[in-house]
């Protein structure tokens, strides 16, 4: 049994770092395989991972954690059965991708704007809390060529944008990921999208 | 063997400043979250606060946003805290804690005392 | 602010029987990563606290096996199954779920 690429693995930076990794051939890998790891400080113990298939060759592991510190490096060891196939190390600081924005609304009873919210994936005594900025993608639901990216790079999970700029009754969605500069970040998967009516309409001596 | 060893006792006029320290041994500070804790004489604990020493992120109860400021030094393992306007109130033993992630090392206390 | 409230007090108990103190969160206290940091904490008196009990349940090392934790939601409850004259002091119970996080006003164990 080989390991064919080895285990890579990125940090939501609050309780779970997904590692994933290649075999040399089809493994059932909750069977045959552990990821073991244990934090690099006093006393911590060994944890286990019960990696599950991700594709014929390919294993992930969601590695479970308290809480994470800049400075927190794991030792990992891939073992099938009594055979060691890989020993390596992760610093979930160097890795992170942050959790996905939640709860995405659209909210249209201002006749000329558009407001759109969100929530921070994080709570306030997370680091990331206070370093996300944001991506909103708003689409035109009849036409994929009608689609524009905002970058809100305050720190208000909210993006306010004028009717008007969008078709009149058409159907539009958004949505909206995040990353954290700080920490030079890959961008967070998509939120689930949201859809809304743009019933808004030029005044009459502007048509 | 893991030890947090705070500064010794003070005694301050009301309105003035003190800053306390707590030296950790054993282990790096930048390896956990650093918390300050408050014990008025005869009471509980109240939580005050923390830092990561790496990064310097802290975070406050309200209550003691803006009476305390939270630092650390990493070169010299040591996390500290400062306390503003001092008013009689103020009077307690406060406790370094290291937290990674539940309150495993505590700091001997430090008591500071306000009094005209 | 969640708080955190201790019944009883103080406890007063003859060596060999029983403790029990409960605790009770004003909301839920599960983490956004589904842990739920209840601890509890023992100060001796003239003593920093300690550490007992961790995420509900778990004794922290050297802790003697006849402290247990239990509980879910917003009631946790400490017991001691044979109260010894060492376990004298306040007991504490905690949240580190939420910022800011808080302790109970805690209960005072006697021996009679």
């Known amino acids: 049994m080989k390991v064919l690429q080895e285990p890579t693995c990125v940090s939501d930076y609050m309780s779970i770092s997904t590692c994933e990794w290649k075999m040399g051939g089809p493994t059932n890998c909750s069977a045959e395989l552990r990821l073991l790891y244990q934090l690099v400080f006093q006393s911590s113990e060994t944890h286990t991972c019960v990696p599950e298939n991700n594709g014929g060759v390919g294993c992930v592991c969601h590695l479970l954690m308290d809480d994470v510190v800049s400075m927190d490096n794991y030792t990992l060891d891939l073992w099938a059965g009594q055979q060691l196939l890989w020993k390596g190390s992760f610093k979930p600081s160097e890795h992170v991708k942050p959790r996905a924005p939640g709860n995405l609304t659209v909210h249209t009873n201002v006749s000329d704007t558009v407001l759109l919210t969100w929530s921070n994936p994080y709570p306030p005594d997370n680091y990331l809390y206070n370093d996300l900025t944001y991506a909103v993608n708003i689409w035109n639901e009849n036409d994929l060529a009608d689609s524009r990216i905002h970058n809100v790079t305050y720190l208000k999970p909210t993006l306010r944008i004028p009717a008007s700029t969008l078709k009149s009754g058409i159907s539009y969605r958004a949505r909206v990921r995040a990353w954290a500069q700080h920490y030079n970040t890959t961008w967070s998967e998509w939120s689930p999208s949201t859809k809304w009516y743009n019933s808004y309409r030029e005044p009459f001596e502007q048509r | 063997e893991v030890q947090l060893v705070q500064s010794g006792a003070e005694v301050k006029k009301p309105g003035a400043t003190v800053k306390i320290s707590c030296k950790a041994s054993?282990?790096?500070?930048?390896?956990?979250?650093m918390h300050w804790v408050k014990q008025a004489p005869g009471k509980g604990l109240e939580w005050m606060g923390r830092?990561?020493?790496?990064?310097?992120?802290?975070i406050y109860a309200s209550k003691f946003q803006g009476k305390a400021t939270i630092t650390a030094d990493t070169s010299s393992n040591t996390a500290y805290m400062e306390l503003s306007s001092l008013r009689s109130e103020d009077t307690a033993v406060y406790h370094c804690?290291?937290?990674?992630?539940?309150?495993?090392?505590w700091g001997q206390g430090t008591l500071v005392t306000v009094s005209s | 602010d969640i708080v955190m409230t201790q019944t009883p007090l103080s406890l007063s108990v003859t060596p060999g029987q029983p403790a029990s103190i409960s605790c009770r969160s004003s909301?839920?206290?599960?983490?956004?990563?589904?842990?739920?940091?209840l601890e509890w904490y023992l100060q001796k008196p003239g003593q920093s606290p300690q550490l007992l009990i961790y995420?509900?349940?778990n004794r922290f090392s050297g802790v003697p096996d006849r402290f247990s934790g239990s509980g879910s939601g917003t009631d946790f409850t400490l017991k001691i199954s044979r109260v010894e004259a060492e376990d004298v002091g306040v007991y504490y119970c905690?949240?580190?779920?939420?910022?800011?996080?808080?302790f109970g006003q805690g209960t005072k164990l006697e021996i009679k």
């Open positions: 830092i990561d020493p790496t990064n310097g992120y802290t």
């Open positions: 909301q839920s206290i599960v983490h956004s990563n589904g842990n739920t940091y």
């Open positions: 995420k509900v349940t």
């Open positions: 804690v290291s937290r990674r992630p539940w309150f495993a090392y």
């Open positions: 905690f949240q580190g779920s939420h910022v800011p996080y808080t």
């Open positions: 054993g282990f790096n500070i930048k390896d956990t979250y």
